[in-house]
Structures are given as C-alpha cells and as structure tokens.
Interface confidence: low
Amino acid sequence: FEIALPRESNITVLIKLGTPTLLAKPCYIVISKRHITMLSIKSGERIVFTFSCQSPENHFVIEIQKNIDCMSGPCPFGEVQLQPSTSLLPTLNRTFIWDVKAHKSIGLELQFSIPRLRQIGPGESCPDGVTHSISGRIDATVVRIGTFCSNGTVSRIKMQEGVKMALHLPWFHPRNVSGFSIANRSSIKRLCIIESVFEGEGSATLMSANYPEGFPEDELMTWQFVVPAHLRASVSFLNFNLSNCERKEERVEYYIPGSTTNPEVFKLEDKQPGNMAGNFNLSLQGCDQDAQSPGILRLQFQVLVQHPQNESNKIYVVDLSNERAMSLTIEPRPVKQSRKFVPGCFVCLESRTCSSNLTLTSGSKHKISFLCDDLTRLWMNVEKTISCTDHRYCQRKSYSLQVPSDILHLPVELHDFSWKLLVPKDRLSLVLVPAQKLQQHTHEKPCNTSFSYLVASAIPSQDLYFGSFCPGGSIKQIQVKQNISVTLRTFAPSFQQEASRQGLTVSFIPYFKEEGVFTVTPDTKSKVYLRTPNWDRGLPSLTSVSWNISVPRDQVACLTFFKERSGVVCQTGRAFMIIQEQRTRAEEIFSLDEDVLPKPSFHHHSFWVNISNCSPTSGKQLDLLFSVTLTPRTVDLT
C-alpha cells in the first residue's frame, strides 16, 4: 500500500490496533522491513507499507483526520470529499474525521444528502455498520450531538464555533463519498439546530446533546421538523431527567405555525402536544444548575407523523356535567406488538393534548378527538359509583343502569361499563331488575349476545362473583345483600345495534341476610341452567344463596343436578341444601357434605332452592350446577 498526503492538506492518517480479536498469530504493519503496530502519516508524507498477515482488518483500524481551520482564512465550503480516496486505502475499518474550527459568530451547517440520518441511542448499532458521530464545541469543551445511522429523517445539523464529524465505515463497505456538505450560516445563538424532514408517515427518535449524560448547563438546542401540511405530528417523551436548577427552569418550547401563543412552553413532565399540522420547532432549554448537586438534564423523545384520520378533524363532546362519581377511560386494547411501523393511536383533549389513554371525570363537559389510524385499537372503560349513605332517603329508590347515549355515540368500542353500587352496611340491600330476563352464562349454555352483565361483590375483603348474565333467559331479578359491582361488558361491535336490549334497574330494598336471591321464571321452550356463585373457586365460606323458581299452573318443573355429590368437605359447620315447596311449605333438607345430591325431581308448584355453605377445607369447594325444565302437565294434580 502507498499513502501520499499532499502538503498543506491538513490530513493525518493513523493506522492502529483496533479491538483485539482472539487470534493466535500477531499481525504487524511492515515498513522498510520493520514490524510496527501503529503508523502515523502527516501532510506532505508518502509512506509505503504492507501487513504481515492475510486479514489485517481483524487487527487494525485506520483513522483519517482532516482539520479545517475557518479562523485564519476562508472556509472550504461545499461537498466534502473522502481524502484520500477509499480505493487507495487498505481494507480496514476506517473512520474519516473532519474537525472544523470557526469563530463563535459563525454558524456551520452540515447538510446530508439522501439517505438522511437516523439518531441511535447508547448501546444501539447501525445495521450496515456505517455510523456518523457528530460533536460540537462550547469553548474548549466537546459536546456530543449524537450518533446517527443512514435511512432516517435528519437532513441538516447547524452548529457554531466548530464541529467534529466522524464517519465510520466497516472494511467491507464500498462507500466512496462522504454524503454531506458544509455550508456557512449566520450565528444560530444556541448549541445546535437539528432539522428532521418527513416526506410521509414515519417516526423519529431524537436525543438531547450528550445523551445519556447531561445536557450542557444553561444551553439551548432546537429541532426543526419539516412535516407535509396534510400530515399530523405528535411528540412523546420516552425518557427524561431533570437537573437541580438554581436559576431559571428547564423547559421545552414549541413554535407551532399558526398558533397564537408561540412559543408554547411546556415542562418536561407535562403531556406534550399532539395532532400538530405541518412544520413545527421544539427547543430544549437548560438552567443554571446547583454547583453542589447539579444533577443531569437529558431527554429522549419520539416524533410520530401520520395521516389524520377522518376522526381527527371531528370533535366529540362528552358531557359528564350532570354525572356524579363517574370516570371514563379511553385506552389501547391489549394487542401483541408487531415489528413493523405502526402509526400511533392517540386520543386528544381539546385537540391538542394527545396521549395513548385519557381519563375523563364527571362534573364537566369534555371535548375530545382522535388521532388514530384504526379506532378499533382503542376501547372505553367506564366506572360509575351509585351510593346510598342515608338508608331512610334511599329505601325503595331506583336507578337505571343504562350506558349514557353520549358514550354510545363515541367512535370507540365500549369494553366495560361498571356500576359500583354501595349501600349502608346491614341497613339496605339491592335488587337488580332487567328490562329483559337474563340467562346465566354456563359452559352448558354459554351466552352468545354482544354483551353481558358481570355481577360481583364490591366488598374489598369478599371474593364473591355471582356470575355473568346476558339478556334472553329466565332470571327475572337478582337480589344481593350488600355492595356489588355490575359490569356491562361488550363482546362484539354489534353492541351498538343491540344497545336497546340493555337495561337494568337497581333498587335499594330492606336489608336481608342471604348473600343473593335469584328469581327465576322459566319459559316452557328451554332448559334453564343455574350455577352457584364463584364457579370454579367455590361458594365462599358460610355463604347462603337462594333461587325462587316459579312454576306456571299448567306446567311441571324438573329439577336436575349435574353431579352425584357436591364434593364439598367441611372444616367447620355443615353445608345444606333446602328444597321447599312454596305453597305447602313442605321442605327437603340435604346435607351437602354427606348426602348424595337428589335425583331429578318434579315440582308442580313454585319452589325454593337454598344452598348454605360451611367453612370448607381448601381444594374441596362447593360448586353446583343444576337445571330447571318445564313440561306441560298431563294430569291435573290439584
């Protein structure tokens, strides 16, 4: 190899040992029969050398540094050449370094031809191995602007007082151009300006200078985003730290064309703007730090640019001003992440504060819009508390458990609407009366409607789930002893069409001791399946539930249990089942922890089934499934 550097080219070439690889045989640079491990070639020198091994790229790296002095004479602006040409260099991992020194009043601009640059964070690497490391200078201190790969959005970086650009090329890479040019600009009066150009949808992750270390004290850094006017941009902070400020406050400032409040100032902890149309600037301003304990300011953020959906121009009014104790959350539904670019999906409050989830509370009118490619990626969860504190006032009072139409009109699927129903302890109980009789969801007869009601105790210490119920069954009402939550859960988008089928009224009634009472009026056409609460986990200890089963005059009911024994083993107390004819009060009592369950029995009149649990041993729980079937009476037994 022969490297000749022209006189006054201000180029230095350094060949040195790189990161050692585990190779048994050492390798040397051979020059005039001498074996050396480092070679430095300065301007005006011509050196001929070889390597003592077949694969020098496993041992050595080459650095080519060009110092450009803009202090003492004119600056060589324009396209930057790779000197010496890569074809004249040995095939080693090579780093071209350009060190440009300029006056504080001179702005320097690096312009990157396509492909533009993409910033990478600590520990990341570029797929093709080609990296651009860019540094600036504040007085004598070097400041790292960032490390970049190809195929990104960064088109220009402006600095003043000097710039150091290092282009790293792997030994096998054929690139023979620098890919950038230098231009002079007037003073930018800040550390740097990074221009990021979006031609279509996409995202960019960017970082403050020196990231992940601290941003220089009391400095200002600006990012200029060039975004087509028909697209929308949203900013989200991925990671940030605040330093300990003695004077001034750390902040970000947005310059948004068309905004009447430019610049818009945000704290780093604030929700950042979204749904911005067209170009905008973002600036990070540091503060005067506490000398004793400065801390660090750092910021890593993402800009997401995407098409506005039809929805993003629509404002939805969610009027919760007449509601009390209610919160509505719009959030992403859980999905598996895909590896390809997925446009963001945001919900925006007042069109500007956008985030992936949003909670609206009662007492106000809220204006929301969406910035989302596919609104099925979001769903809504609502929680409303209806509580009674004074039993004298509430008794016999009724409330309709209906999803407000304002919520149904939103373009996002409702997932859960939960009513927390709270009563004064030992004073009142609750009754739920559906508009349409309910079916209990069982394995034998699952619900296939677009929604169900999930009824569970809302007493923190009590693990009691009454079950899942959907319209179209035989359960006329459900009475519960104390606080419960009723959740309307939707299972299909067709809920919007079926919304009229929802309707549940809750009334506060005099207190009763049983945990729950189900009133069942079977239809002649179908078999009614009923199961004890807390299926799969077992009826809680010492809990009693009843079913009031109506039998019409001309029918006979067949009561069938689906196993021979209950399976419960009592630690203390006894588990009982009482089947009682309502007309004659005649009753049969079964010891569930001892007796076999009754064979199918026929009932000509309305009857009760009451099940009371003991304190069971763990693993031997009480779970019962039974059915009621009506058939016409063949003989009049009255």
Epitope: E269, D270, S327, T329, T359, T361
Partner: antibody
Framework: EVQLVESGGGLVQPGGSLRLSCAAS????????IHWVRQAPGKGLEWVAS????????SYADSVKGRFTISADTSKNTAYLQMNSLRAEDTAVYYC?????????WGQGTLVTVSS | DIQMTQSPSSLSASVGDRVTITCRAS??????VAWYQQKPGKAPKLLIY???SLYSGVPSRFSGSRSGTDFTLTISSLQPEDFATYYC????????????FGQGTKVEIK
Amino acid sequence: EVQLVESGGGLVQPGGSLRLSCAASGFNLYSYYIHWVRQAPGKGLEWVASIYPYYSSTSYADSVKGRFTISADTSKNTAYLQMNSLRAEDTAVYYCARYYYAMDYWGQGTLVTVSS
Amino acid sequence: DIQMTQSPSSLSASVGDRVTITCRASQSVSSAVAWYQQKPGKAPKLLIYSASSLYSGVPSRFSGSRSGTDFTLTISSLQPEDFATYYCQQGYAGSWHPITFGQGTKVEIK
C-alpha cells in the same frame, strides 16, 4: 434537595376534623402526583388519596371517600388532607409522598389519634 | 380493586442468606409495581420501581422481577441493615384502579 414535611396531626375526638399539610421543597408540587398514605399502629401501609395538582385530579380509597378531601396550593407548594367525620379506625401515622415512577420521596409522617 | 397478596408475612433469615418475597396481583396489572423498605418509626424507602428497575442509591443486592401477575423482590445476600419490613405496591398515580399495598413482609434475624 427534595423534601416533604407533614404537619397538622394530633388528638381529635370521633366525629371531629383535622387538616394535614404537606409542605414540599426542592421540586414543583404541581408537576407530580402527591399521595397520602397512612399506617395504623402495628399495621401495614394503606393508600388514602392522591392529587395531580396540574389537572386538579383527585382519587380516594373507598374507606375515606366522602369524608376526606385532598387539595393543593401550588403557590405555597403545599398539599393538604382535610379529614372530617373522623373515626377511631382513622388513627394512624399519615405520610405524604411524591410519585414519579413510584413513591420516591416520603415525608417523616404525622400522627393522628382519634379517641374520646 | 386489585389486591396484592404478599407472602410470606414474616420470615427469619441470617446474614448472607438469599431472601425472596413475592406479591401476587389478583388480576392482570401493568409493570407499575414498586417495592419499599420500612424500618420501625421511619418512613418507607423506595427500593425498586417499574417492577425491576433499581432506584438510585439502592445497593445492587436488591432486585425485582415479574412473571405474569407475580412480582418478586430478591435480596441476594442479606446484610444486617436489611432487617426491616418490605411492602410491594401496585398502581400508578391516577390509574383507574386505586393504589394498593401488599400486607408487608417482616424480615427478622434468625
């Protein structure tokens, strides 16, 4: 240096009221969630209430809903817990804590005793 | 509300022992789970946030991990100053489910 200092605790009769203060220094109160957490003698920690002063959004544990009110005065960099209709079971050390990924800074606590 | 069931409620261990404390969430939760250490008469101190991130200034013998709805705090080699009560906590400020703490685990000297 980040610091939280609670005050306002003391002995109060059942049904009475108390107002606890949590004075913050070293950070802006309105940028963080502030929580009140209590600990009854010999018992574990129980979350009581939280406020995000920037949006004035509040939430409460079921056990104190309707009786306790959390608020903040950002000009004084102080959060408050107004406790009404106090019961014996409200007896505890009350801590205020700042939330940033977790409750990273806590006050020293103030003791509230509800007894006749 | 989401319950955090912490186990064991107490344990006896010796200096140098590896100690594991578990919290099980009653339903699926985000990774907004933190662990705190509390000594008698003192306020709790944050050890772990976001299920597995070590808070600054906390010795590296403390670590946190997650598996489904189970969250674990591990002390790799117990030191004399580690004898205290440890609490897990789920929920993040303003989340729909209120913040809840585990019942606590008292780590005592064997």
